[in-house]
């Protein structure tokens, strides 16, 4: 069954700046990735970025830089200042649409004992499976 993993990291240099990395482990051709915060996309969450493999990338504040890392993973850097900046317990969600297979979403937040600058494991909890 396809899996989506989400990794949230606080930057050591800017303590209110976050990097979100998401990846898809499954079959099909990724046709769209949606990154949101505050909950799942379409269920109270606010869209931060939409990445399309051909039509390009759209992002909204406080997203600073969204990019493809590989054909099946993305990263997003968030600005750390202003009223709309994330806090330590913010939930980030990534939804991958894979043609012609389906779409799957997983969410994650900063690990409770997160040491800024130290990266979490490549596929940290939580991983949400579509079982």
């Amino acid at each position: 069954t396809p899996e989506v993993w989400v990794q949230v990291r606080m930057e050591a240099t800017e303590l209110s700046s976050f990097t979100i990395r998401c990846g898809f482990l499954g079959s099909g051709s990724i046709s769209l990735v949606t990154v949101s915060w505050g909950g799942p996309n379409g269920a109270g969450g606010t869209t931060l970025a939409v990445l399309h493999p051909e039509r390009g990338i759209r992002q909204w504040a406080p997203a600073r830089q969204a990019r493809w890392e590989t054909q099946s993973s993305i990263s997003l850097i968030l600005e750390g200042s202003g009223a709309s900046s994330p806090c330590a317990n913010t939930t980030f969600c990534c939804k991958f649409a894979s043609f012609p297979e389906g779409s799957w979403e997983a969410c994650g937040s900063l690990p409770p004992s997160s040491d800024p600058g130290l990266s979490a494991p490549p596929t940290p909890a939580p991983i949400l499976r579509a079982d």
């Epitope: 099909g28 051709s29 043609f99 012609p100 297979e101 389906g102 779409s103």
Partner: antibody
Framework: EVQLQQSGPVLVKPGASVKMSCKAS????????VNWVKQSHGKSLEWIGL????????NYNQKFKDKATLTVDKSSTTAYMEFNSLTSEDSSVYYC??????WGQGTTLTVSS | DIQMTQSPSSLSASLGERVSLTCRAS??????LNWLQQEPDGTIKRLIY???SLDSGVPKRFSGSRSGSDYSLTISSLESEDFVDYYC?????????FGGGTKLEIK
Amino acid sequence: EVQLQQSGPVLVKPGASVKMSCKASGNTFNGYYVNWVKQSHGKSLEWIGLIDPSNGGTNYNQKFKDKATLTVDKSSTTAYMEFNSLTSEDSSVYYCAGGTVYWGQGTTLTVSS
Amino acid sequence: DIQMTQSPSSLSASLGERVSLTCRASQDIGNNLNWLQQEPDGTIKRLIYATSSLDSGVPKRFSGSRSGSDYSLTISSLESEDFVDYYCLQYASSPVTFGGGTKLEIK
């Protein structure tokens, strides 16, 4: 694992319409799109289109855009394909599939007067 | 639409033999190719996804590979239940298209 149960064989007259179903066991499609595929007797497979059960979004093969209508009933976790203006060319076996991995057993459609 | 040319359309082979089936794509599809198996009663099962990844529960005698625009399904040692139909499908772009199929027959 998603198990898909398709409706039984149907015999209809030319010009009529038919609606076949594809029921997901366990009350969930588990994120998978429902694809519909046509297999004419002794021939290869043709992709008709897909529907996203989560929001009803569709993607049709242009060849079948005016022939097929894909819908889903989330409450019963059942996908439907309606075929209209039937001719003998539509006599085939029709499969639904969860993505490309979980396949229904097929529904045989016979169009005959 | 992307055309998938599958060969041979039928193949006679013996138990224990190694066979390869091929699909050629009319344009670049990357690794976006799956292989399906269809039994005489119509049951369809996916064997390989993304050119070379084996689906769970599929015997290790099945493998997939690519050379340029040619994609192969290889069965290393044929068993009796392998003498059925096989199809490739590409999903690099919509619409999904299938190869014409290969009927594997026992010699």
